[in-house]
Amino acid sequence: APVRSLHCTLRDAQLKSLVMSGPYELKALHLQGQDLEQQVVFSMSFVQGEESNDKIPVALGLKAKNLYLSCVLKDDKPTLQLESVDPKNYPKKKMEKRFVFNKIEINNKLEFESAQFPNWYISTSQAESMPVFLGGTRGGQDITDFTMQFVS
């Protein structure tokens, strides 16, 4: 069967929403009222990978765009990017590892760990309107905890 994809939005633990910042970058900032319509809607696909009750492998595409979050090495550092793909071939059940995130939910906290780079997480800064990035620390200054709102 084809891969199942569901639409959702994400907010970090500070309740910042994610929006596009240029063609290939996301940033996190506080939105309210009608401005919430600016937030990115993800198409979250349930993909192949090691799975448990608390950990589910997913790919995060942007709804109605052929862009996926991916993790690659840049200057020897794991880096989060938005990568353009051929919409005829994506999403698929066996996504390349750079596109796969372990969605981990424990005690009301949702984290997205890179499958390619274990212990590196989708992160936001405390500061407003800063880029979403791949961070290698949890529980520090940067935010790695999110909530997810599924949408129609």
Epitope: C8, F46, D54, I56, E105, K109, L110, M148, F150, V151
Partner: antibody, heavy 119, light 107 residues
């Protein structure tokens, strides 16, 4: 025995609030996504709220979004549905059900609690 | 949103009869389909998921089949305790929606 028991239903005027509870037993509550499904009198079933096992994921259809809030207390094996700004069309039996977004189906259901919104 | 249409909306059959209910989705749901049984005044009960997998403890006289947009629920030999309303539900994309139900009665 796996069991879900709802409570908190009743008769309420339009615009008022009601809070439903669902007590779970016989399984490890904190490991399961949970949902509320309602059934209007003589009608079919409508999925009205979902919360993931840890509480970080939620879903509401447009018909209740902004008015209903689902929450859970895993330490007390209890699911809640806070219903505000109630409308006559919210009248029905509200079922607590195990399952939701990830699994997709509902494998355990409570007996339901009736809610009537009328002036 | 994907809409689910069940047919017939009601039917009468005799004990021992083979009974078939169909469910049509407005789009391809790739076997992400469940069937529930609801007896009067009771909660729904899961019978079948993933179009054809029988839930734990469900008698083998119940079965499901289909693919794409068209699915079938069958009771091979109707028993008196099968009097109920049956619902299909898809879980391919949010919102997961239910069919309007098929009320099964015994003649």
């Amino acid at each position: 025995e796996v069991q879900l028991v709802e409570s908190g239903g009743g008769v309420v005027q339009p615009g008022r609030s009601l809070r439903l509870s669902c007590s779970a037993s016989g399984f490890i509550f904190s490991r399961y996504d949970m949902s509320w499904v309602r059934q209007a009198p003589g009608k079919g079933l409508e999925w009205v709220a979902y919360i993931s096992h840890g509480g970080a994921g939620t879903y509401y259809p447009d018909s209740v979004k902004g008015r209903f809030t689902i929450s859970r207390d895993n330490s007390k094996n209890t699911l809640f549905l806070q219903m505000d700004s109630l409308r006559p069309e919210d009248t029905g039996v509200y079922f607590c059900a195990r399952g939701g977004v990830t699994k997709g189906y509902f494998d355990v259901w409570g007996q339901g609690t009736p809610v009537t919104v009328s002036s | 949103d994907i809409q689910m249409t069940q047919s017939p909306s009601s039917l009468s059959a005799s004990v021992g009869d083979r009974v078939t209910i169909t469910c049509r989705a407005s789009g391809n749901i790739h076997n992400y389909l469940t069937w529930y049984q609801q007896t009067p005044g009771k909660a729904p009960k899961l019978l079948i998921y993933n179009a054809k997998t029988l839930a734990d403890g469900v008698p083998s006289r119940f079965s499901g089949s289909g693919s794409g947009t068209d699915y079938t629920f069958t009771i091979s030999s109707l028993q008196p305790e099968d009097i109920a309303t049956y619902y299909c539900q898809h879980f391919w994309s949010i919102p997961y929606t239910f069919g309007q139900g098929t009320k099964l009665q015994i003649t």
